[in-house]
Interface confidence: low
């Protein structure tokens, strides 16, 4: 018996969106027990029909899809997972993380979590959308355009994989989309910045100019800053990001957005992998999500937080990193940057928990949608009570009480914020002073989670 579907396209809703959302959520929750038996949370694997668009090892690339026939929203998520930039570290990656280089062992289904969940409780933002998860198997930050050959041991086709997935999805209902949101985490987040304009251009050329293409870049806004301790470019993790990308682009035959490429000389295209340099050149609206103290950024900067208390030099370096990142986001109107030590957020099940200035990420994304919808009516002012620029201003890691739990990397134990800050070498007097508080008051506030 085919299930009747009720198209709910929120982009068409005028007036009190919050009240409407509350009613829909209530309706969904009341209907949920009846339909729980039929609900299938899984996204199903489709390997690309065009088998010349491949993963590193020549196996066909693909995507996982869960259709939502009543919706004209499509969410395409780019997976992350570092990269490799020479024969040796790609060989090593192939031997230790093969699913990031080959489709041969991919499971037939995946569960959608976080922003990919179809449960309104877990995904109050876009639970009704068509969900697409594109596994990362090109190791090139979604930028490559070279196939496997006698000369090339591996294919690097990240940019081409995205184009081919979009092409195939047009035959599966994407052609009727109103909004395509290209999202991604970590290397996938950087992949969004590198590919969002190209996807918009592709759809225009194929005759779908009405599809609004937007980007959501999570944990992919990196800085080409000075490492805490400089190390030679030996492996993926210790190599300075500028050097790794410089080498990678040549190895992958990497492509960057045209408008950004024109801003830099030949051989300097690596600059376009860094959010604060590529963002001003993008035409599509992009929402940037970035922890101010991103663990992957710290890793490439050679900061490894062990069980030992942090030395003052390192503490200042970490604080300065947060300051620099905050500065790069000042002209990014749609951004969500909590002062936490973490990495990735949007496909975590508890992605709704973190707040900046009292606003959660799904709420901020909803406000962003509204602002884009309203901007067609030439209104450029931020919506009252619906903020989209949310960057923490407090200056140390986990000064935001809604940050995800920190674990002591040495013992694996959960730490409360006061413990964590002392562990980081922060003197409570120093932390309390700028807030105009006594250390005892601050400790009280932190342990109460306020």
């Amino acid at each position: 018996q085919p299930v009747e579907s009720f198209p709910l396209d929120f982009t068409a809703v005028e007036g009190n969106m919050d009240s409407f959302m509350a009613q829909v959520k209530s309706l969904a929750q009341s209907l949920y027990p009846c339909s729980a038996q039929q609900l299938n949370e899984d996204l199903r694997l489709h390997l690309l029909l065009n088998t010349s668009v491949t993963c590193n090892d020549g196996s066909p690339a693909g995507y996982y899809l869960k259709e939502s026939r009543g919706s004209r929203r499509w969410l395409l998520f780019l997976e992350g997972g570092w990269y490799c930039f020479n024969r040796e570290n790609c060989d090593s990656r192939y031997d230790t993380m093969r699913r990031l280089m080959s489709s041969r062992d991919w499971p037939r289904t995946r569960t959608g979590t976080g922003i990919l969940s179809s449960q309104p409780e877990e995904n109050p933002y876009w639970w009704n959308a068509n969900m697409v998860f594109i596994p990362y198997c090109s190791s090139d930050v979604w930028s490559g355009a070279s196939s496997k050959s006698e000369k090339n041991e591996y294919a690097f086709m990240g940019a081409l994989i995205i184009q081919e997935v979009v092409r195939e999805l047009l035959g599966r209902g994407l052609s009727g989309a109103k909004v395509l949101l290209l999202a991604g985490s970590s290397a996938g987040g950087t992949g969004v910045l590198l590919n969002v304009d190209r996807v918009a251009e592709q759809l225009e050329k194929l005759g779908y100019p009405a599809i609004q293409v937007r980007g959501l870049a999570d944990s992919g806004w990196f800085l080409d800053n000075k490492q805490y301790r400089h190390t030679d470019c030996v492996d993926t993790i210790t190599c300075a990001p500028t050097e790794a990308i410089r080498r990678g682009i040549r190895y992958w035959n990497g492509v960057v957005p045209e408008r950004c490429r024109r801003q830099f000389q030949e051989g300097e295209e690596w600059n376009c992998f860094f959010g604060y340099k590529v963002y001003p050149t993008l035409r599509c609206p992009v929402f940037v999500v970035q922890w101010l103290f991103d663990e992957a950024q710290l890793t490439v900067d050679n900061v490894h937080l062990t069980g030992q208390p942090v030395q003052e030099g390192l503490r200042l370096y970490i604080q300065n990193l947060g300051r620099e990142l905050r500065h790069t986001l000042k002209d990014v109107p749609a951004s969500f940057a909590p002062a936490c030590l973490s990495h990735e957020i949007i496909i975590r099940s508890h992605w709704t928990d973190v707040q900046v200035k009292g606003t959660s990420l799904p709420r901020a994304l909803h406000c962003w949608d509204r602002s884009l919808h309203d901007s067609h009516k030439a209104s450029k002012t931020p919506l009252k009570g619906c903020p989209v620029h949310l960057v923490d201003s407090c200056p140390w890691p986990h000064c935001n009480p809604s940050c995800p739990t920190v674990r002591d990397q040495f013992t694996g134990q959960e730490m409360n914020v006061a413990q964590f800050l002392m562990h980081m070498g922060f003197d409570m007097q120093t932390v309390a002073q700028p807030q105009g508080l006594e250390p005892s008051e601050l400790l009280g506030m932190l342990s109460n989670g306020s």
Partner: antibody, heavy 119, light 111 residues
Framework: EVQLVESGGGLVKPGGSLKLSCAAS????????MHWFRQAPEKGLEWVAY????????YYADTVKGRFTISRDNAKNTLSLQMTSLRSEDTAMYYC????????????WGTGTTVTVSS | DIVLTQSPASLAVSLGQRATISCRAS??????????MHWYQQKPGQPPKLLIY???NLESGVPARFSGSGSGTDFTLNIHPVEEEDAATYYC?????????FGSGTKLEIK
């Protein structure tokens, strides 16, 4: 059944040579990186050498570098360890092991072959 | 090279009780959400047998009384309830980088 079987061990004089083999069966050998380990009598496990699935990358422990050579023949499903300039401290049980490709742990081990270096 | 310090060197546990073995790495062996630490069991005259991979995942066919935990540099293998057949030497191993190294082993005796 997934299996690794070592052979070629024996008694050899210091300075001598020996070639160990490891025959793989029950799985697609060419898909896996392979390692050699050794264990001296009443001692712990020591890594000796590694070869990637397609022989593109090889690594050796400092203690054997320049004396031992790891190789593989994917057509014949065999892994080899050529040992030269043998020393008494090379005396051990030698194991070949399959490295699982998603995490670098060793999920299949051979039964071992004994190498004794003594005059 | 990463040094793995295993403790205790030997352990005697009564049948049905809990055995806890620790392994501390000289450097963090966790990255990008994975902890590259694994546990093996070895009985006399036999090769090592994989028990736990990536810190906490039970290898197929291994009884559920074996469990692993930890992240960063500190890892633990628990066996509960201990059975007669668990008498063996247990090794931790990291795969965070080459060379992969092993702990010095913990010999478990059943009382």
């Amino acid at each position: 059944e997934v299996q690794l079987v070592e052979s070629g061990g024996g008694l050899v004089k210091p300075g001598g040579s020996l070639k160990l083999s490891c025959a793989a069966s029950g799985f697609t050998f060419s898909d896996y990186g392979m390692h050699w380990f050794r264990q001296a009598p009443e001692k712990g496990l020591e890594w000796v050498a590694y070869i990637s699935s397609g022989s593109r990358t090889v690594y050796y422990a400092d203690t054997v570098k320049g004396r031992f050579t790891i190789s593989r023949d994917n057509a014949k499903n065999t892994l080899s360890l050529q040992m030269t300039s043998l020393r008494s401290e090379d005396t051990a049980m030698y194991y070949c092991a399959r490295k699982h490709y998603n995490g670098g742990y060793f999920d299949v081990w051979g039964t071992g072959t004994t190498v004794t270096v003594s005059s | 090279d990463i040094v793995l310090t295993q403790s205790p060197a030997s352990l005697a546990v009564s049948l049905g009780q809990r055995a806890t073995i620790s392994c501390r790495a000289s450097k963090i062996v966790s990255t990008s959400g994975y902890s590259y630490m694994h546990w093996y069991q070895q009985k006399p005259g036999q090769p090592p047998k994989l028990l736990i991979y990536l810190a906490s995942n039970l290898e197929s066919g291994v009884p559920a009384r074996f469990s692993g935990s930890g992240s960063g540099t500190d890892f633990t293998l628990n066996i509960h309830p201990v059975e007669e057949e668990d008498a063996a030497t247990y090794y931790c191993q990291h795969s965070r980088e080459l060379p992969p190294t092993f702990g010095s082993g913990t010999k478990l005796e059943i009382k």
